[in-house]
Amino acid sequence: PEPPTACREKQYLINSQCCSLCQPGQKLVSDCTEFTETECLPCGESEFLDTWNRETHCHQHKYCDPNLGLRVQQKGTSETDTICTCEEGWHCTSEACESCVLHRSCSPGFGVKQIATGVSDTICEPCPVGFFSNVSSAFEKCHPWTSCETKDLVVQQAGTNKTDVVCGPQDRLRA
């Protein structure tokens, strides 16, 4: 028979034959042959693999470093990674929760709508037209654009949500 060019789900092609993938929680020890099945071994104590795979090494469980304010939310298994969270009152910096901050800050283009409290994080809002914020802050609101007219100047460069307007002198009409 012709050697296969594609294999079924949960199989992989090697040496012109289809071998079974290792199930989640196990790693590959040796590929199948004409005469033997794929050989797999369970991951070790602090390791995991979360998919059907042909990996020769399991992944290490994530370490929830207490020095970064992290603690274990859900202990890892041979099929799942450890899930970290932050100590009470602290907030993850990303979905992966690799570090913790007391509260988030608002990026340029956003102002602080509500300063963080012990129970709620900072609430940011986008700066509307006519306002800007050029800094990251946990307390600054959006600032209004400078009014060139009140300084007897004209707008030389329009403002954005991140920058103030630039004012300049009015063009003098030559006699």
């Epitope: 020095n67 970064l68 932050c86 100590e87 602290w90 570090s99 509260h103 988030r104 802050s137 307390f139």
Partner: nanobody, 116 residues
Framework: EVQLLESGGGLVQPGGSLRLSCAAS???????EMWWVRQAPGKGLERVS?????????YYADSVKGRFTISRDNSKNTLYLQMNSLRAEDTAVYYC?????????WGQGTLVTVSS
């Protein structure tokens, strides 16, 4: 490595004053918004006061408004908190913190005890 070293705490009578300092190193101090945060015994962290990088804008919690003054000296990489008219409820460990408030960038704090 970011280091924040608070000092100036101590025991003071109600109505008294203290000036806290925070010596900063390991980052460009003048570029960062800075905060004072406190933790009373058995309580959570309370945001006390903040100052923007060049010192022109400040924030104070309602509980300290009119009594505390935050300031900074960018040439000395130091943040200050002048605390006047101190009350028993101001008793806490005071920490200085920089944006974006990473857990691992906090100092040890300085203990302020207000008691007669």
């Amino acid at each position: 490595e970011v280091q924040l070293l608070e000092s100036g705490g101590g025991l003071v009578q109600p109505g008294g004053s203290l000036r806290l300092s925070c010596a900063a190193s390991g980052f460009t101090f003048r570029d960062y918004e800075m905060w004072w945060v406190r933790q009373a015994p058995g309580k959570g962290l309370e945001r006390v006061s903040a100052i923007n990088p060049w010192g022109g804008l400040t924030y104070y919690a309602d509980s300290v408004k009119g009594r505390f003054t935050i300031s900074r000296d960018n040439s000395k990489n130091t943040l200050y908190l002048q605390m006047n008219s101190l009350r028993a409820e101001d008793t806490a460990v005071y920490y200085c913190a920089k944006l974006p408030f990473y857990f691992h960038e906090w100092g040890q704090g300085t203990l302020v005890t207000v008691s007669s």
